[in-house]
């Protein structure tokens, strides 16, 4: 029976050009984490394997850094990075746990003035 739960950083709104950290944490289970995959839509960004360590997909190597911990750092954010990210924990004997984080990357003009939001 799968008793674990995944806690995430929560959804993030960030500005174009900045960097953010995506993190998940698996709790409430004694299962062993064998591998953590980070994916966006259907693309694999990175893998952290308990034995083999980190592998970053070649197409993301210049903007994705491993860590901290089992998390992932995204740098030089673009509007195209807006989307849903998944941390997929492969565990034994429980199986797979998945966390979801949505990243909203705003153009600088939107972040500063957009949507006629007023901040008192």
């Amino acid at each position: 029976m799968m008793t674990g739960t995944i806690e995430t950083t929560g959804n993030i709104s960030a500005e174009k050009g900045g960097s953010i950290i995506l993190q998940c944490h698996l709790s409430s289970t004694t299962a062993q984490v064998t591998q953590v995959n980070w994916e966006q839509q259907d693309q694999l960004l990175a893998i952290c394997n308990a034995d083999l360590g980190w592998h970053i997909s070649p197409s993301f190597k210049d903007r994705v850094a491993p860590g901290p911990g089992l998390g992932l750092t995204l740098q030089s954010l673009t509007v195209n990075d807006t989307g849903e990210y998944f941390c997929i924990y492969h565990t034994y004997p429980d199986g797979t746990y998945t966390g979801r984080i949505f990243l909203e990357v705003l153009e600088s003009s939107v972040a500063e003035h957009g949507a006629r939001f007023q901040i008192p």
């Epitope: 959804n11 709104s13 705003l106 939107v110 008192p120």
Partner: antibody, heavy 117, light 112 residues
Amino acid sequence: EVQLQQSGPELVKPGASMKISCKASGYSFTGYIMNWVRQSHGKSLEWIGLINPYNGGTSYNQKFKGKATLTVDKSSSTAYMELLSLTSEDSAVYYCTRLLRFAMDYWGQGTSVTVSS
Amino acid sequence: DVVVTQTPLSLPVSFGDQVSISCRSSQSLANSYGSTYLSWYLHKPGQSPQLLIYGISNRFSGVPDRFSGSGSGTDFTLKISTIKPEDLGMYYCLQGTHQPPTFGGGTKLEIK
């Protein structure tokens, strides 16, 4: 002025599919996420999913996976939601809403969908 | 999914009253950067919902200052200082910090 103009009310038969449109104006369509939300009669609001018009990326509420498909046409600044295999449970008012900092700042006028034989 | 509980379900008021609506979430709505994505909406009969407050306490453009939001973590409040006829309707809170976003069940503000 930001506006989201939705297509008109629909009466459809059980088992049929249909598509609702949401035409955006007054802002840069590709610069903001578009959400879809529904309200069944006498119930609260439910988030269906979202689409990023910039790259077509989507995120769905698990409850609506296989029920709703979200697409956009950038050339006409229009978002679409196709509803599949409709049942009476899908009778509701459906809204498109613009997202900014995870708040829904502008809403379409709503599209009433009635599923009945 | 994060469960959002609104109280009360119904709030009978007289014009000029001050009222509070509570919204509680099953887990903290603060993300790792300290941002909390909690917003409030008013849904009037025959209209679309409209944004009142975003990010706990920021009033959206054009929203009168009789509306104010407060709270942190899992516990949030919308206050309306002097009820006017145009304030009647259903109020909803929305958490946008965790996927999927979830709405509260709503609070109906109606005349006594």
